[in-house]
């Protein structure tokens, strides 16, 4: 697995360099997670033909994956920093159960899956420090998450691969939208 941001040899070798600002650290963290997702998607796509599935087929699913909408204030039109930040944190918290599901889904990229999960937890902490209105952030119910996880793990092999593919694709899209929005803050 790649080295998490802030732990690479360049940082160690250059103590005179300006420390990263909060925004730079968040930016770097998201890009690191996106790299991890790319590696996981590569294994998924090599293993099955899920990646050729049409958008229509993927839309017909029973999952409730977080998605950016106009009302969330993260797009250029109607941008609202506070609303958007709440949406990003809430969405990441909702993705956590799906990232847990991914943990036993990879053979050669097992460490990478763990790195994506742990790095997302760190990203949430970074963003929570940045947020002013933490009360507006709803944390998913652990009981609901536990039964969702059980349900996902109960699926047949094809559905598990399809679910894995969809989680990775949706998480990638969510992070890319978050990255664009955070760069405006």
């Amino acid at each position: 697995a790649p080295v998490p941001p802030g732990e690479d040899s360049k940082d160690v070798a250059a103590p005179h360099r300006q420390p990263l600002t909060s925004s730079e650290r968040i930016d770097k963290q998201i890009r690191y997670i996106l790299d991890g997702i790319s590696a996981l998607r590569k294994e998924t796509c090599n293993k099955s033909n899920m990646c050729e599935s049409s958008k229509e087929a993927l839309a017909e699913n029973n999952l409730n994956l977080p998605k950016m909408a106009e009302k969330d204030g993260c797009f250029q039109s109607g941008f609202n920093e506070e609303t958007c930040l709440v949406k990003i944190i809430t969405g990441l918290l909702e993705f956590e159960v799906y990232l847990e599901y991914l943990q036993n889904r990879f053979e050669s990229s097992e460490e990478q899956a763990r790195a994506v999960q742990m790095s997302t937890k760190v990203l949430i902490q970074f963003l929570q420090k940045k947020a002013k209105n933490l009360d507006a952030i709803t944390t998913p119910d652990p009981t609901t998450n536990a039964s969702l996880l059980t349900k996902l793990q109960a699926q047949n092999q094809w559905l598990q691969d399809m679910t894995t593919h969809l989680i990775l694709r949706s998480f990638k899209e969510f992070l890319q939208s978050s990255l664009r929005a955070l760069r405006q803050m």
């Epitope: 017909e60 699913n61 053979e107 349900k151 699926q155 092999q157 094809w158």
Partner: antibody
Framework: EVKLEESGGGLVQPGGSMKLSCAAS????????MNWVRQSPEKGLEWVAE??????????HYAESVRGRFTISRDDSINYVYLQMNNLRAEDTGIYYC???????????WGAGTTVTVSS | DIVLTQSPASLAVSLGQRATISCRAS??????????MDWFQQKPGQPPKLLIY???NLGSGVPARFSGSGSGTDFSLNIHPLEEDDVAMYFC?????????FGGGTKLEIK
């Protein structure tokens, strides 16, 4: 030819143990989840246990009625799946089938079955 | 658990006519546009044989007299025209998620 062949059935007393075996041939065994399904006149067809792949850490799942008493295992080197049955009850009586689900979940291959009778 | 209710429990149909067996699931068995409902035929002393998978796809070597339909929670198996060889027990099974569950079965006889 894709084939599953069960063995190990017979008569056992309540509270006793028995181990069923299933020999698989004609397909890449290590790529498939494997299951045991049983059938009795009283309960009809009833799924019993499942074992997944090495990449899934050989995850196992059981029907509520057998959990804690039955153990499913596999040996990919010799293409065998097993069902260890302990603390057997009269209601465990039936024909036990070894089945292979295809990738989409359908049980497309079944063995001929082995009969288990639990009686004193 | 997904409960499958099959009806009727037994059915007598004349040769050459249509036999229809229904199966209702306690919750939806479809996802990503596929219905994970399968149909099996079982004759005495034999294991179940796959007839239909994913609600409407014909199993290998199964004659076209057999067809399956339905989505969501309601499914049916049709046999037309009925032949002598079709006398058997028929079961539906959901293959969406474990515990993998079966219907109670339908005994098909010739009238």
């Amino acid at each position: 030819e894709v084939k599953l062949e069960e063995s190990g059935g017979g008569l056992v007393q309540p509270g006793g143990s028995m181990k069923l075996s299933c020999a698989a041939s004609g397909f890449t065994f290590s790529n498939y989840w494997m299951n045991w399904v049983r059938q009795s006149p009283e309960k009809g067809l009833e799924w019993v246990a499942e074992i997944r792949l090495r990449s899934n850490k050989y995850a196992t799942h059981y029907a509520e009625s057998v959990r804690g008493r039955f153990t499913i295992s596999r040996d990919d080197s010799i293409n065998y799946v097993y069902l260890q049955m302990n603390n057997l009850r009269a209601e465990d009586t039936g024909i036990y089938y070894c089945t292979r689900p295809r990738y989409e979940g359908t049980f497309d291959v079944w063995g001929a079955g082995t009969t288990v009778t639990v009686s004193s | 658990d997904i409960v499958l209710t099959q009806s009727p429990a037994s059915l007598a149909v004349s040769l050459g006519q249509r036999a229809t067996i229904s199966c209702r699931a306690s919750e939806r068995v479809d996802s990503f546009g596929i219905s994970f409902m399968d149909w099996f035929q079982q004759k005495p002393g034999q294991p179940p044989k796959l007839l239909i998978y994913a609600a409407s796809n014909l199993g290998s070597g199964v004659p076209a007299r057999f067809s399956g339909s339905g989505s969501g929670t309601d499914f049916s198996l049709n046999i037309h025209p009925l032949e002598e060889d079709d006398v058997a027990m028929y079961f539906c099974q959901q293959s969406k998620e474990f515990p993998w569950t079966f219907g109670g079965g339908t005994k098909l006889e010739i009238k």
